[in-house]
Amino acid sequence: EAHKSEIAHRYNDLGEQHFKGLVLIAFSQYLQKCSYDEHAKLVQEVTDFAKTCVADESAANCDKSLHTLFGDKLCAIPNLRENYGELADCCTKQEPERNECFLQHKDDNPSLPPFERPEAEAMCTSFKENPTTFMGHYLHEVARRHPYFYAPELLYYAEQYNEILTQCCAEADKESCLTPKLDGVKEKALVSSVRQRMKCSSMQKFGERAFKAWAVARLSQTFPNADFAEITKLATDLTKVNKECCHGDLLECADDRAELAKYMCENQATISSKLQTCCDKPLLKKAHCLSEVEHDTMPADLPAIAADFVEDQEVCKNYAEAKDVFLGTFLYEYSRRHPDYSVSLLLRLAKKYEATLEKCCAEANPPACYGTVLAEFQPLVEEPKNLVKTNCDLYEKLGEYGFQNAILVRYTQKAPQVSTPTLVEAARNLGRVGTKCCTLPEDQRLPCVEDYLSAILNRVCLLHEKTPVSEHVTKCCSGSLVERRPCFSALTVDETYVPKEFKAETFTFHSDICTLPEKEKQIKKQTALAELVKHKPKATAEQLKTVMDDFAQFLDTCCKAADKDTCFSTEGPNLVTRCKDALA
């Protein structure tokens, strides 16, 4: 239904608190360099305006679109060109081009300092003084660093944050209460960010059809008892929600997500038997819970997939009559039977099936041609299964840090031109897949591993797009989203790479490394490891292990020494010499 005032409609639907939070997220994701205070001022102005429209929908400007209202606010910011350069040119355009222009200027890797968590006492003091401002800062800091973060989900994480602070700030030992809990939220939020970025990439690069296919596969796995019509309705709604969020329409996105959650809870009987616990929760928790609800029990009497999609003489006729519906049905039927497959794998199988029908249905005897299609799926299924086994075995043998290092060596060899910080970030993230997925039951490993790796590799592609340096990476990133992970896995040592010359200063360390937190120490060591591989791309695992063990021993010795500075300055050059010899 059309509303006289869109802004009044959204304010009424969402309520003041969520409305303000979403507007703050929107502004922070568009203008990532502005301070919290600048954005908070704009949010208050927009909220006051929304209230006037609620009071009188016919008031001046209340009929304007949200893009027009928000865009006008952003374009009125003083010193826009000085702070944002060519983004200011967006303000010369009319809607909808202006909003598209803002979207194109979102920076996936903004040059902002890492978000440092204040110490417990300070955090609790400012939280108690003004919880609203404190949470506003959280939304602002996360949103500007993650310009595609799923806005309604960020409100959920802010709510989690709030609950943790409320609980822990009342404890005697605030630090030990806060640290593990906030670390848990941070980890989940970071994973949520890369997953959502992948969805937006899918939408931006391949359109709604590609995202809808992803949604059909995912929903069919989770709700195997829902019929195809129900899955299609949910996938269509979910596509709309994600399109809105990826497009910066955060108020509509959050509103439609709430509607979708409501619909699911009102129609549990035709969707899944597992929704009740989620549906008993308040809005943000409910929507979050539904998004990661456990798979329903698969129907016991499902016929073999071959009956309708291989053995039936009508396959090509059905395909001709409604290609997308027939392929959608195939994806639905295959996915509901395979909660143990990754969505990426299911989409590759559907693509293979489509290609087979395209080829076979044009032949004089199609059934003879497509009759072997399911057998042709086998190598596509085996490849990720082997990947999971090999990598989980390696993780179990080396632990997370050692596994990250193995991945770092592998990926530096595949794409040595990529900057060391990007390689280290990617390897650390890829390496976390072990901790995240390899401990799960066998039937959950493959979907966890592959879909997580795909999301991380999407980030690698986004960073590489800004400054393309590796033909290997460009090749894998320019293909379809579902083929990226197999493409990266298949890459070998880049033979075109001219090794970096050995620079002693790259491997020179000082006593300040001793006081760094463990994570920062690991990053320093991993930076050195990547640089070693860039110097000697064909170094054996044994050679690299020797050097890294020597390096670890050197750090341990010097950090325990009475005179650390002297130890570093005398033993450091010896270490460099030994490294050069070991790799000669």
């Epitope: 003489q313 001709a320 009559e321 044009a362 032949e363 199609p366 059934p367």
Partner: nanobody, 115 residues
């Protein structure tokens, strides 16, 4: 909406000829192999002939090989069946179908071979 409309049937004497046509719409005709099937009075469906999307490959049932010729004109979205040396046992309703389908969804065209 996929539509297949057969025409060209009629009464013909044994040894005579007929040319059946099938006008197709609602799908990418050239991307699909096509088939002629027939159903004699009181009998089940019988496959007659098939042709690939490009028209380069053709297949025939033993009972019609050497007498019937399947062809297509992709520019006109039309399938043909040239039937020569017709016999009384060729009497049937003839249907065109998509791919290897043996269950028609069209009206068909009646061919009667009788003296």
């Amino acid at each position: 909406k996929v539509q297949l409309v057969e025409s060209g049937g009629g009464l013909v004497q044994p040894g005579g000829s007929l040319r059946l046509s099938c006008a197709a719409s609602g799908f990418t005709f050239s991307s699909f192999g096509m088939t002629w099937v027939r159903q004699a009075p009181g009998k089940g469906l019988e496959w007659v002939s098939s042709i690939s999307g490009s028209g380069s490959d053709t297949l025939y049932a033993d009972s019609v090989r050497g007498r019937f010729t399947i062809s297509r004109d992709n520019s006109k979205n039309t399938l043909y069946l040239q039937m020569n040396s017709l016999r009384p046992e060729d009497t049937a309703v003839y249907y065109c179908t998509i791919g290897g389908s043996l269950s028609p969804s069209s009206q068909g065209t009646l061919v009667t071979v009788s003296s």
